[in-house]
């Protein structure tokens, strides 16, 4: 057992002349609070599974008001850190999402909004026990200066937390074959109590005579490294000469999710989906208040003052559990009508419709010509979402109310002079041309490159095109 | 503006060392990290590992975990990174970048290390 | 280590064309890819951070989009100086990788 800590030490505008705007103003006061989320490193999750190394909420920072004119500076921060206790072995690598919120204090109604303005992630290898890591990540235009560590809880120590330290029995020495518990020279190791031959670095215990393995590894005895690639099932327990998992039981065999958790098997391991009130891997994490931020994905905290009584998370559209851990898959439930393309926005759902249908949820069947009157004689033409006019000649526009200039687009070639005629254009052909646009010339010896014109136009004079 | 200047090029024989500056200059150098890649001719970038100029930290990759060092001298506001032992294979411009984990924003101009017999 | 794999690893295109470039992650980073221009002789340059934070100075013809897995940068009418060869990076896991990178050349 042990805690993961976070101090977050600057939020503020990247270098560069593009740097933002403050997130608050003098109309919308603000302040800003943070989330971090954990994982096991190793673990395939999907990128929106629940937090299972655990999660925190800090307190609100100082209330800010932007400077107007000024640029915006590091913003006021929460006083201390952020803790992730975790019950089980530290996991050695693990994964991190930090979010910075903002909460505008304006006059919203229903109370404050909130607000992602960044968020970054990470994955990192880290022994329990060691110094402060620093990091320096940008998002967007913010950039977010932190520190972490993971920190065993007595009488735990190790890197991964998983020895015991006891109080000194004799004042100048350990036991026999027991060693001092650096750095706490004053007390020693715990006798060993799991099962003999446990792997020291792979495996450790809870209770005497059991051997639990480290993520990566299996047997009995926590010596054989997991490895999938070449297995079929992603099943334990382990074959020791290949190091495969060969197909045994489930990982939801027994219910591993304590405090009446639901368990349900995910490709590589198992996820409890827990009762409000309980939160962890497996759902061991208990009296748990609004203090500890346990509603995540920005939901909001009500109750829950003291341990006895719990809280209720009251999750943003889009997601949903006791935790507001779940992301809510709205487009499966294929609410665009007549093809929609479904957009889960997070804040709201979008459809975006198919040409010729419209509504929020492209219930509407457009009619494009429906109420649509096509001036002067221009018939409505269907398709594509929108009514377009076939217009009668000598008319144009969208609804066939100008009156086109058919001469407009120069149509008479080879230097024909055009008029406009209440049945279109006519072409006044230059010497040597002829057609209804100007566009054959006339032979020398007075053949035409076509048939001849028609009966009573000479060659040169002007063609009327109907 | 901000500014990485590196030291000049430099040929070594196989097995000896080679010690590559990068100076800084444009902003306070304690307020970001320095990393070093390295790229072979006509390949790809390869992550070195960095410094953290305030705390000395440094993080390597594997691949050069017991051959690169990494100091630093405040007062010239100057980062070197030393790699040992070296081999053919090591021949490739090196380059210092400013940085935190997730971007690397201004690069120095690149030192050529020749490794040859 | 995180492999990253680039296409197409050569591009051929005309100055005014749009032009596409693919990154993709041996496993989810989320949205911790970079992406780096580089011209011979010369050091990466920084565009694109978290898969589509466009760093300052750098024109708004280049953007950057994708998360997990699968991540593209596009060039939405390439000028005569865009011809080089980018690289994608990601930061997500220690130690930061590079992709083979895309060399942009003249048709």
């Known amino acids: 057992a042990g805690v993961f800590e976070l101090q977050i030490h600057s939020f503020g505008p990247g270098p560069g002349p593009g740097a933002p705007r403050s997130p608050c103003s003098a109309r919308l006061p603000c302040r800003l609070f943070f989330r971090v989320c954990l994982k096991p490193g190793l673990s395939e999750e999907a990128a929106e599974s629940p937090c299972a190394l655990g999660a925190a909420l800090s307190a609100r920072g100082p209330v800010y008001t932007e400077q107007p004119g000024a640029p915006a500076p590091d913003l006021p921060l929460p006083d201390g850190l952020l803790q992730v206790p975790f019950r089980d072995a530290w996991p050695g690598t693990f994964s991190f999402i930090i979010e910075t919120w903002r909460e505008e204090l304006g006059d919203q109604i229903g109370g404050p909004a909130w607000s992602l303005l960044a968020r970054v992630a990470g994955r990192r290898r880290l022994a329990a026990g060691g110094p402060w890591a620093r990091d320096i990540q940008r998002a967007g235009a913010w950039e977010l200066r932190f520190s972490y560590r993971a920190r065993c809880e007595p009488p735990a120590v190790g890197t991964a937390c998983t020895r015991l330290c006891r109080p000194r029995s004799a004042p100048s020495r350990c036991g026999p074959g027991l060693r001092p518990c650096a750095p706490l020279e004053d007390e020693c190791e715990a006798p060993l109590v799991c099962r003999a031959g446990c792997s020291p670095e792979h495996g450790f215990c809870e209770q005497p005579g059991e051997c639990r393995c480290l993520e990566g590894w299996t047997g009995p005895l926590c010596t054989v490294p997991v490895s999938t690639s070449s297995c079929l099932s992603p099943r334990g327990p382990s074959s020791a000469t290949t190091g495969c998992l060969v197909p045994g039981p489930g990982p939801c065999d027994g219910n591993p999710c304590a405090n009446g958790g639901s368990c349900s098997e995910t490709p590589r391991s198992f996820e409890c989906t827990c009762p409000r009130g309980f939160y962890g891997l497996r759902c061991e994490v208990s009296g748990v208040t609004c203090a500890d931020g346990p509603c995540f994905n920005g939901g909001l905290c009500v109750g829950g003052a003291d341990p006895d009584s719990a809280y209720i998370c009251h999750c943003p559209p889009g997601f949903q559990g006791s935790n507001c851990e779940k992301r809510v898959d709205r487009c499966s439930l294929q609410p665009c009508r007549n093809g929609g393309l479904c957009l889960d926005l997070g804040h709201a759902l979008r459809c975006r419709c198919r040409a010729g249908f419209a509504g929020p949820r492209c219930e509407h069947d457009l009619d494009d010509c429906a109420g649509r009157a096509c001036a002067n004689g221009g018939t409505c033409v269907e398709g594509g979402g929108a009514h377009r006019c076939s217009c009668a000649l000598g008319f144009g526009g969208r609804d066939c109310r100008e009156r086109a200039d058919p001469c407009a687009a120069r149509p008479c070639a080879h230097g024909g002079r055009c008029y406009a005629h209440f049945s279109g254009l006519v072409c006044a052909c230059a010497p040597g041309y002829m057609g209804a646009r100007c566009e054959f010339p006339v032979h020398p010896d007075g053949a035409s490159a076509l048939p001849a014109a028609p009966p009573g136009l000479r060659p040169g004079d002007p063609q009327r095109y109907l | 503006q901000v500014q990485l200047v590196q030291s000049g090029a430099e040929v070594k024989k196989p097995g000896a060392s080679v010690k590559v500056s990068c100076k800084a200059s444009?902003?306070?150098?304690?307020?970001?990290?320095i990393h070093w890649i390295r790229q072979a001719p006509g390949q790809g970038l390869e992550w070195m590992g960095y410094?953290?100029?305030?705390?000395?930290?440094?993080e390597f990759n594997q691949n050069f975990k017991d051959r690169v060092t990494m100091t630093r001298d405040t007062s010239t506001s100057t980062v070197y990174m030393e790699l040992s032992s070296l081999r053919s294979e090591d021949t490739a411009v090196y380059y210092c970048?400013?940085?935190?984990?997730?971007?690397?924003?201004?690069w120095g101009q690149g030192t050529t290390v020749t490794v040859s017999s | 280590a995180i492999q990253l794999t680039q296409s197409p690893s050569s591009l051929s295109a005309s100055v005014g064309d749009r032009v596409t470039i693919t990154c993709r992650a041996s496993?989810?980073?989320?949205?911790?890819l970079a992406w780096y221009q580089q011209k011979p002789g010369k050091a990466p340059k920084l565009l694109i951070y978290?898969?589509?934070s466009l760093e300052d100075g750098v024109p708004s013809r280049f953007s950057g989009s994708g998360s997990g897995t699968d991540f593209t940068l596009t060039i939405s009418s390439l000028q005569p100086e865009d011809f080089a060869t980018y690289f994608c990076?990601?930061?997500?896991?220690?130690?930061?990788?590079f992709g083979g990178g895309t060399k942009l050349e003249i048709k």
């Open positions: 970048a400013r940085g935190g984990s997730n971007f690397f924003d201004y």
């Open positions: 444009g902003y306070t150098h304690t307020r970001y990290w």
């Open positions: 410094i953290n100029p305030t705390t000395v930290y440094t």
């Open positions: 496993e989810n980073i989320y949205y911790n």
């Open positions: 978290t898969a589509n």
């Open positions: 990076k990601q930061a997500y896991d220690v130690p930061p990788t």
